[in-house]
Interface confidence: low
């Protein structure tokens, strides 16, 4: 028998430095957990302890914090080198900057393999990108080989900006040849490393023969085996077991996100290459690990260059930017105007003819809204003025809801108005008018939402059992401020861009913004 | 509802250790921090430590940090406080609380226990 | 350690007539936009109760007339329409870094 140790990491979202337990910004440094720091030391200790260790990443090191908005995926690169990673599987975000955002800092700066085997490039990419991701890579561990073998996300072109001249082809179909290649090659242990989500890997885990282990990424689930060490809730024992189509059981593994946990499985395999056994758990990298004084070093030295960024002039207003809590939580605010603007400005996908874009719609509680803009500073907004506005460092993400969900949502949205309390809801793409007289759950009068298959953008009733896409952020997609209706009935959920960052681009992108109070939320009494 | 529970009034001598127990109901338990303060008679309030009872974390205020030791037991959703080597000076009413922190890490105490008088 | 100053001692103040109560701090309790300060309000025999959490938000079921202010290093709780239920302690408290610690109290008397 031979004994593999598999470390793994996914959707760390450019947490390089530690956090706090909620993976926001580290405040009281004794709680705060995660960073490549501390990652380094476990990772270290781990290597030192035993023989045949690989450190893996299933995808997202791209997009979260000021890191990546600064550094661009240099600090990835850098970051990963730097802690020997042996191999990354392609997540969608890594496109958010475009193919070229991908080539130039991460691609050619990575001294480990970038894989995926269901990207395919065509036309004048293809001979650009050539060699510098690959569908599988061969490593030595100790004295055997193992086979690394990726996988992307097909709904990237949704989701990123992977440009035309890349085909996201069906994981499943794409993977087979190439894991049959690899038996070929007489390599017997292979592993499947990707970022498609759980739902996915446990697919691929059943359907593509020769897989040996599936570590993922992408739905940012937490596996654990015993009780769970901090907040966050199993999704089912680590790893998870997949029966095969063939009879096998293959083992599942993810890491949560955020660089909050190490994933932590040994697998044992035969001399023909079958899995005997897996065990494991994720290890909570907590404060009681120390940080490596040399990577904390080198984090702050590269540290300095965010402060400065952080006070830099990304755009001007000319209006007051009203994001106080007396406006933002009891009627339409020109501050939650301007973040659903940036938030649909953000997804504009032109992916389908049929359609002028694949989402119209925003949503965005007003108690997410933490500080207004005043424009007599010159009109001067920084990333700090942004900041203070969005200060919780969560994400804008795209759902899937039915008509009938939303039509909760914006009933809740109302319920006990007046008592200045978080869920009042800004909106766009939508026209929503309220009839306070009526009772609670009784009160949205119309509603009205901004078509997407057409070529001219009008606002048309909702219908309850028509599916729509919405962009909003992950607190309201894990059913903050009391939307339980999102979470449970939500089809699709999608992590999407830092919040701080979609605005600041936007911004940057408008150069002088003007927002308005429009008309989008209006209250009536009486009848329709 | 969330409610926190705690033990009863103790009268303690100098020397001894005192146990105060808290309770808690109508919430996850082990995702969120209990931390302790203390009252004396006509005094302020004053922060002893805290526990996530999830993974047993503990911090406590240097003041206390060699007296006082904070526990949870997660099966009956109770934490503990104990703190040794009793003086007058200990004389207080010891509250539990629960911080909140959803949205964000804010550590503000959103639900208290009775408060438990413990008297030396 | 944060040391938090609070002021006046005690306010007396006849109902209808706005309260404002000051909590300064030796040390910056402000990041990432956020202010790490709240207060709380406590009646004789009785536990302290949240009224305002990171500085301006009003904890659910406090009524509105509690309001909170301020950023960095100095707070000013308001109570504005002052009513006689109102007659109680009043402490601030930050949660910036360990160890958390409490302002000494302002009593508001209602005349």
């Known amino acids: 028998a031979w004994e593999l140790t598999i470390l793994h990491t996914n959707d760390v979202h450019s947490r390089l430095e530690q956090t706090s337990e909620d993976s926001s910004k580290c405040v009281n440094a004794s709680r705060c957990m995660g960073g490549v720091a501390r990652l380094f030391t476990k990772v270290q200790q781990i290597r030192r302890a035993e023989p045949n260790v690989l450190l893996l990443d299933a995808g997202d090191q791209y997009q979260g914090t000021i890191w990546f908005t600064v550094y661009k995926g240099a600090e990835v690169a850098h970051f990963m080198n730097a802690l020997r990673y042996d191999a990354m599987a392609l997540g969608n975000h890594e496109f958010d900057n475009g193919v070229e955002g991908l080539i130039e800092p991460l691609l050619k700066e990575a001294k480990f393999p970038i894989l995926s085997a269901n990207i395919k490039a065509k036309g004048p990419l293809a001979s650009q990108i050539s060699g510098l991701y690959l569908p599988y890579k061969v490593l030595p561990v100790g004295d055997e080989v193992v086979g690394i073998v990726g996988y992307t996300s097909k709904e990237t072109p949704f989701l990123s900006n992977p440009g035309t001249n890349l085909v996201f082809e069906d994981e499943i179909t794409a993977l087979q040849p190439e894991v049959d290649k690899l038996k070929t090659l007489n390599v017997n242990k292979i592993i499947a490393l990707g970022h498609s989500g759980f739902e996915m890997d446990k697919l691929i885990a059943q359907k593509v023969r020769g897989v040996d282990v599936v570590v993922g990424g992408h739905s940012n689930t937490f596996l654990y085996t015993g009780n769970p060490p901090s907040k966050e809730v199993p999704a089912g024992k680590y790893p998870f077991i997949v029966t095969s189509d063939d009879g096998r059981k293959v083992p599942v593994v993810q890491a949560y996100a955020f660089g909050k946990y190490l994933g932590y499985l040994k697998i044992e395999f035969d001399e023909r290459g079958n899995v005997i056994s897996s065990h494991g758990n994720p290890i909570l990298l907590n404060s009681s690990i120390p940080e490596d004084p040399s990577i904390k070093a080198d984090i702050n030295k590269w540290r300095i260059k965010l402060d400065n960024y952080s006070t830099q002039e990304l755009g001007k207003t000319i209006v007051y930017l009203d994001g106080s809590s007396q406006s933002c939580r009891f009627r339409e605010c020109n501050m939650g105007n301007l973040i659903c603007d940036a938030m649909i400005n953000n997804n504009l996908r032109h992916t389908d003819e049929m359609f002028w874009n694949h989402v119209s719609m925003c949503i965005l509680n007003g108690g997410g809204i933490r500080s207004p803009i005043d424009e007599r500073n010159n009109g001067t907004i920084t990333w700090e003025n942004l900041a203070a506005v969005l200060p919780f460092g969560g994400t804008f993400d795209l759902v899937q809801l039915k008509g009938s969900t939303l039509k909760k949502a914006f009933e809740h949205s109302v319920h006990r108005y007046g008592q200045s309390t978080g869920e009042f809801l800004q909106v766009g793409g939508i026209h929503v008018v309220y009839d306070l007289s009526r009772k609670p759950g009784d009160r949205v009068v119309k509603l009205d939402v901004l078509c997407t298959k057409c070529r001219v953008p009008s606002y048309d009733p909702l219908k309850m059992d028509e599916v729509y896409k919405v962009i909003l952020p992950n607190f309201l997609a894990n059913g903050g401020d009391g939307f339980q209706m999102i979470k449970d009935e939500l089809l699709r959920h999608d992590s999407g861009d830092q919040d701080i960052n979609v605005v600041s681009t936007y911004i940057s992108k408008m150069k002088v913004i003007y927002p308005a109070v429009e008309g989008r939320i209006k209250f009536s009494t009486g009848s329709h | 509802q969330v409610q926190l529970v705690q033990s009863g009034a103790e009268v303690e001598k100098p020397g001894a250790s005192v146990k105060v127990s808290c309770k808690a109901s109508?919430?996850?338990?082990?995702?969120?921090?209990i931390t302790w303060v203390r009252q004396a008679p006509g005094q302020g309030l004053e922060w002893m430590g805290d526990i996530y009872p999830g993974s047993g974390n503990t911090n406590y205020n240097e003041k206390f940090k060699t007296r006082v030791t904070i526990t949870a037991d997660k099966s009956t959703s109770t934490a503990y406080m104990e703190l040794s080597s009793l003086r007058s000076e200990d004389t207080a009413v010891y509250y539990c609380?629960?911080?909140?922190?959803?949205?964000?890490?804010?550590?503000?105490?959103?639900?208290w226990g009775q408060g438990t008088l413990v008297t030396v | 350690e944060i040391v938090l100053t609070q002021s006046p001692a005690t306010l007396s103040l006849s109902p209808g007539e706005r309260a404002t109560l000051s909590c300064r701090a030796s040390k910056n309790v402000a990041t990432s936009g956020y202010s790490y300060m709240h207060w709380y309000q406590q009646k004789p025999g009785q536990a302290p109760r949240l009224l305002i959490y990171l500085a301006s938000n009003l904890e659910s079921g406090i009524p509105p007339r509690f309001s909170g202010s301020g950023y960095g290093t100095d707070f000013t709780l308001t109570i504005n329409n002052i009513e006689s239920e109102d007659a109680a302690y009043y402490f601030c408290q930050h949660s910036r870094e360990l160890p958390f610690t409490f302002g000494q109290g302002t009593k508001v008397e209602i005349k």
């Open positions: 609380a629960k911080e909140g922190g959803l949205t964000t890490e804010d550590y503000a105490l959103d639900y």
């Open positions: 109508g919430y996850t338990f082990t995702s969120y921090w």
